[in-house]
């Protein structure tokens, strides 16, 4: 949602968190701002304090309940407002009617671990975190492997077009240090985006057996 010179973007993690970023040209100095969430069909409402993340943008997390509680559904609409204090009053800076399941960004996958490693291959598994049971199997993943002498940006993306919480990396170089990351995205939602990348998992392939080609 854009109001005046501001931009207000929020994502739902599919369970109990709405994360918002508000950016404003000609930023207000020393002003207290909040995001207010008012669902259309729930008894609760929630507020979070916007904190600066850069010169002209602020962010906050609306914690709607315990991490794995299902606080919203696809039929919910949440009115989200940015309110800033001016004098003793509050002034609305931005507003949007937020459809949570059209604006999804899941938490980064967790618990990455090496299941099995060989000289040229490595099998890695992970878990998704705080993802709604509504998705059933309608998730996709992207993964990338960091090779020595390269950057993450140069790493080719591997796409898993189904809910598959493991991958077998092949054609690896023996006795080499690698890092691996994965991210997840639901198939649902017009404005849905990829989760952040997982914490990198470092692993080393086994050395080639001596005396073998």
């Amino acid at each position: 949602a854009v109001n005046g010179t501001s931009r207000f973007t929020c994502f739902y993690n599919s369970r109990a968190n709405i994360s918002c970023v508000w950016s404003q040209d000609g930023a207000l100095q020393d002003t207290s701002c909040q995001v207010h969430a008012w669902p259309d069909r729930r008894r609760w409402n929630q507020t979070c304090e916007l904190l600066p993340v850069s010169q002209a943008s602020w962010a906050c997390n609306l914690i709607l309940g315990t991490p794995d509680s299902q606080k919203l559904t696809a039929v919910d609409i949440v009115t989200l407002r940015v309110m800033c204090r001016e004098g003793v009053r509050w002034r609305m800076m931005a507003i949007q009617d937020f459809k949570p399941f059209e604006n999804l960004r899941l938490m980064a996958p967790i618990s990455l671990q090496v299941v099995h490693v060989e000289t040229h291959r490595c099998n890695i598994s992970w878990k998704i975190s705080q993802a709604s049971h509504y998705f059933e199997r309608h998730l996709e993943f992207e993964a990338r492997t960091l090779s020595p002498g390269h950057t993450w940006e140069e790493a080719p993306l591997m796409t898993l077009k189904q809910k598959q919480e493991w991958i077998c990396l092949e054609t690896l170089t023996p006795d080499t240090q690698y890092e691996f990351q994965v991210r997840v995205k639901p198939l649902q939602g017009e404005f849905t985006t990829w989760s952040p990348w997982s914490q990198p998992l470092a692993f080393r392939t086994k050395p080639a057996a001596l005396g073998k080609d």
């Epitope: 005046g4 501001s6 003793v88 009053r89 509050w90 002034r91 609305m92 800076m93």
Partner: antibody
Framework: EVQLVQSGAEVKKPGASVKVSCKAS????????ISWVRQATGQGLEWMGE????????YYNEMFKGRVTMTRDTSISTAYMELSSLRSEDTAVYYC??????????????WGQGTTVTVSS | DVVMTQTPLSLPVTLGQPASISCRSS???????????LEWFQQRPGQSPRLLIY???NRFSGVPDRFSGSGSGTDFTLKISRVEAEDVGVYYC?????????FGGGTKVEIK
């Protein structure tokens, strides 16, 4: 019916203080802001600042900072504006006015009848 | 502070005729949220100010439709389509976009 009833006229000597009251009725006192505006004789209007009775938070126009104090007593739905170190230029009609806690549309909708303060030696 | 300048200072009008008051701000009063908090108040003789118009062109409840507001940026106008006897008084513009909020000096409307 929303009503703001202010205290009566005051005559003060230079250097003294004056405290004007504004009693609210017809709405929930702690849900709205009370602004104070003054009008010197034959002059325009000047916004002095405001108080939110819900938490007692105040904001003063720089021009009056250090001389003005706004308070409230929620038990009797009354707001007060005290102006100290009075000088002849402070001779004016002082108004209280109600405003929404969230400034969505307008600053002040309902006004008190005004209190005349005369500063004279 | 934003200085609000009104013209004319005095406006003699004939009953039933239109009247127009101008208000100019010393800087743009579009708030950073995109709204323009320009308001008009009427003060009849011996009375308290009364809100007529808010956010440039919106009439407050109970205000007759002969009152209208227009303008943008730094230039604003209050129009009375057909002046009635009860419209006599002083009219003030007010900006609520930048603290401290400020009023114009006022325009006195009187019957010729």
């Amino acid at each position: 019916e929303v009503q703001l009833v202010q205290s009566g006229a005051e005559v003060k000597k230079p250097g003294a203080s004056v405290k004007v009251s504004c009693k609210a009725s017809g709405y929930t006192f702690t849900d709205y802001v009370i602004s104070w505006v003054r009008q010197a004789t034959g002059q325009g209007l000047e916004w002095m600042g405001e108080i939110y009775p819900g938490d007692g938070n105040t904001y003063y126009n720089e021009m009056f900072k250090g001389r003005v104090t706004m308070t409230r007593d929620t038990s009797i739905s009354t707001a007060y504006m005290e102006l100290s170190s009075l000088r002849s230029e402070d001779t004016a009609v002082y108004y209280c006015a109600r405003g929404s806690y969230t400034y969505d549309n307008y600053a002040m909708d309902f006004w008190g009848q005004g209190t005349t303060v005369t500063v004279s030696s | 502070d934003v200085v609000m300048t009104q013209t004319p200072l005095s406006l003699p009008v004939t009953l039933g005729q239109p009247a127009s008051i101008s208000c100019r701000s010393s800087q743009n009063i579009v708030h950073s949220n995109g709204n323009t908090y320009l308001e008009w108040f009427q003060q009849r003789p011996g009375q308290s100010p009364r809100l007529l118009i808010y956010k440039v062109s919106n009439r407050f409840s109970g205000v007759p439709d002969r009152f209208s507001g227009s303008g943008s940026g730094t230039d604003f106008t209050l129009k009375i389509s057909r002046v009635e006897a009860e419209d006599v008084g002083v009219y003030y513009c007010f900006q609520g976009s930048h603290i401290p909020w400020t009023f114009g000096g006022g325009t006195k409307v009187e019957i010729k």
